[in-house]
Interface confidence: medium
């Protein structure tokens, strides 16, 4: 167990041209606050996936009133740290999202309004117990400077907060096989704890790193209740008379999801699927409009008729959910025949067929390519009684004997210039883009190219939003 701490040093316009104006309207004073979301590992997780390591919201900063015409200064910040407690081991590698929100003040009907100013995200390696790490991130024309660290809560120590320290039982030395606890030399290292995440209620260990389950529980972390088909009694403790194992109380018992959200159990706890207009761990945050950017993954937001349907997200292919937050796993339907490999590209489904098969779903059994020669490194592809050559870069024609113009298909995105090269093609990218095909913006705009904003926050205790 421990705490991840984040200290925001400054938020303001970044260097270079295009510095933003003040984020406050001349009409409405405003103040800033920050939200941090942590996820374990270095995976490229979508912005809307749960903050599995935890999340925190800062206090509101001082009120800032724009001086008309003045450029945006570094804006006044909230006091104090953002602290995200973690219960299990510190993973060592983590992903973060830090959002800067603007709260508009004034005499607005319906109270203050919130809007997302900037979102930065990154993936880092960090050992618990180490010094503060400093970072600078840019979102569009904004720049955020911050420091962070992970520290263990006593009695946990170590880079993952998995070692425990206890006061010495004897004044002179630690017990057999146990070392003094640096830097707490007057304490001794306790035996290593059970496997990270092992249920404290239903699991135990006799060897460091293991997780053995009490009767009635199973799974690698002892979080899954055992059920037997012969037992029809309701949830409750194991019945001594029948010998039945009956699952204990589940994380979805009593439905922790508010506002009509539906609960589903996950290996570690539960997940709420929220109805439109609500979000948050327990669907507790409401009052979302299109201005809050509630549609993820490029979903199109359309204003709804009333507060119960304040917006509707029209999802692009490959995404679903009231906020387009769920990727449709179309490969789970196993659409590719004859052992083909399914690839869900988001905008489309592709089947990569095994040799000897072709077609959109690998449904065609092809003729043999034996004895057919494709020149210049081309490969023979079977198909409908005739062979076809898949030519290497720079060649074309039926047998790959003709030189092809690799630039003919206009492969360079965003206005990049294409140049034929002996090894294929080279893209000279337009200003602001990079990548082999100029497909990546160099400085993605904070509002549009970054992942979509979560729905707007609403008045109340900031802790509600976690």
């Amino acid at each position: 167990a421990g705490v991840f701490e984040l200290q925001i040093h400054s938020f303001g316009p970044g260097p270079g041209p295009g510095a933003p104006r003040s984020p406050c309207s001349a009409r409405l004073p405003c103040r800033l606050f920050f939200r941090v979301c942590l996820k374990p590992g270095l995976s490229e997780e979508a912005a809307e996936s749960p903050c599995a390591l935890g999340a925190a919201l800062s206090a509101r900063g001082p009120v800032y009133t724009e001086q008309p015409g003045a450029p945006a200064p570094d804006l006044p910040l909230p006091d104090g740290l953002l602290q995200v407690p973690f219960r299990d081991a510190w993973p060592g590698t983590f992903s973060f999202i830090i959002e800067t929100w603007r709260e508009e003040l004034g005499d607005q009907i319906g109270g203050p309004a919130w809007s997302l100013l900037a979102r930065v995200a990154g993936r880092r390696r960090l050992a618990a117990g180490g010094p503060w790490a400093r970072d600078i991130q840019r979102a569009g024309a904004w720049e955020l400077r911050f420091s962070y660290r992970a520290r263990c809560e006593p009695p946990a120590v170590g880079t993952a907060c998995t070692r425990l320290c206890r006061p010495r039982s004897a004044p002179s030395r630690c017990g057999p096989g146990l070392r003094p606890c640096a830097p707490l030399e007057d304490e001794c290292e306790a035996p290593l704890v059970c496997r990270a995440g092992c249920s404290p209620e239903h699991g135990f260990c006799e060897q460091p790193g293991e997780c053995r389950c009490l009767e009635g529980w199973t799974g690698p972390l002892c979080t899954v209740p055992v059920s037997t088909s012969s037992c029809l009694s309701p949830r409750g403790p194991s019945s001594a008379t029948t010998g039945c194992l009956v699952p204990g109380p589940g994380p979805c018992d009593g439905n922790p999801c508010a506002n009509g959200g539906s609960c589903s159990e996950t290996p570690r706890s539960f997940e709420c699927t929220c109805p439109r207009g609500f979000y948050g761990l327990r669907c507790e945050v409401s009052g979302v409009t299109c201005a809050d950017g509630p549609c993820f993954n490029g979903g199109l937001c359309v204003g709804g008729a009333d507060p119960d349907s304040a917006y509707i997200c029209h999802c692009p292919p490959g995404f679903q959910g009231s906020n387009c937050e769920k990727r449709v796993d179309r490969c789970s339907l196993q659409p590719c025949r004859n052992g083909g490999l399914c690839l869900d590209l988001g905008h489309a489904l592709r089947c990569r067929c095994r040799a000897g098969f072709a077609g959109p779903r690998c449904e065609h059994d092809l003729d043999d390519c034996a004895g057919r020669a494709c020149a210049n490194g081309g490969t023979c592809v079977e198909g409908g009684g005739a062979h076809r050559c898949s030519c290497a870069l720079g060649f074309g024609g039926r047998d790959c004997r003709e030189r092809a113009d690799p630039c003919a298909a206009r492969p360079c995105a965003h206005g990049g210039r294409c140049y034929a090269h002996f090894s294929g093609l080279v893209c000279a990218c337009a200003p602001g883009y990079m990548g082999a095909r100029c497909e990546f913006p160099v400085h993605p705009d904070g509002a549009s190219a970054l992942p979509a904003a979560p729905p707007g926050l609403r008045p109340g205790d900031p802790q509600r939003y976690l």
């Epitope: 309207s25 001349a26 409405l28 004034g106 009907i109 201005a291």
Partner: antibody
């Protein structure tokens, strides 16, 4: 029901003065920021003055075109906002609307001000 | 000053049509944009504030969208009472400025 009612408009000589009044009802006037907006065929809709609430020290703001000639004021006890216009010019001719709240949520029916040469 | 431009000064549409009116700002107005409806009798009503937030009492067939310098008002199902002139206005920076208006007529 929210209601804003302007009065005091009419015909005035070039260089003359006029005071417009706006009576408000149906909302908490003392909380509201109040504005005057005018409309003419030549210039369309044009913001003229803003006065904030007591919490904002009744701060006032004007565009350059009327600064020094127009003064906005308010009387929270009477739920009224005023626009004192001095040194009037031909380009000040138009319908003057009283509007309330920072989002310009509520508008009156307007009162016509005509400045003659 | 920030200039607000409504390129279409008049628009003709049929009842039931989906109508979109656009507005462009000379610089980023950071979503501080309102849409108003002015009826032929001069009555002015706020429809949308802060780009897309529907003012209370406004029918849901009205919606707003946009960001930075480009904004639009959409009427999803045109009704007879929607015949009016529509104005955009920025309140990001003083002086607060209005577009020239788009007059909507029935075919």
């Amino acid at each position: 029901e929210v209601k804003l009612e302007e009065s005091g408009g009419g015909l005035v000589q070039f260089g003359g003065s006029m005071k417009l009044s706006c009576a408000a009802s149906g909302f908490t006037f003392s909380d509201a920021w109040m504005d005057w907006v005018r409309q003419s065929p030549e210039k369309g809709l044009e913001w003229v003055a803003e006065i904030r609430n007591k919490a904002n020290n009744h701060a006032t703001y004007y565009p350059e075109s009327v600064k020094g000639r127009f003064t906005i004021s308010r009387d929270d006890s009477k739920s009224r906002v005023y626009l004192q216009m001095n040194n009037l010019r031909a380009e000040d001719t138009g319908i003057y609307y009283c509007t309330g709240y920072s989002s310009f949520a509520y508008w009156g029916q307007g009162t016509l001000v005509t400045v003659s040469a | 000053d920030i200039q607000m431009t409504q390129t279409t000064s008049s628009l003709s549409a049929s009842l039931g049509d989906r109508v979109t009116i656009s507005c462009r700002a000379s610089q980023d107005v950071i979503n501080y944009l309102n849409w108003y409806q002015q009826k032929p009798d001069g009555t002015v009503k706020l429809l949308i504030y802060y780009t897309s937030r529907l003012h209370s009492g406004v029918p849901s067939r009205f919606s707003g969208s946009g960001s930075r310098t480009d904004y639009s008002l959409t009427i999803s199902n045109l009704e007879p009472e929607d015949i009016a002139t529509y104005y955009c206005q920025q309140y990001s920076e003083r002086p607060y400025t209005f577009g020239g208006g788009t007059k909507l007529e029935i075919k």
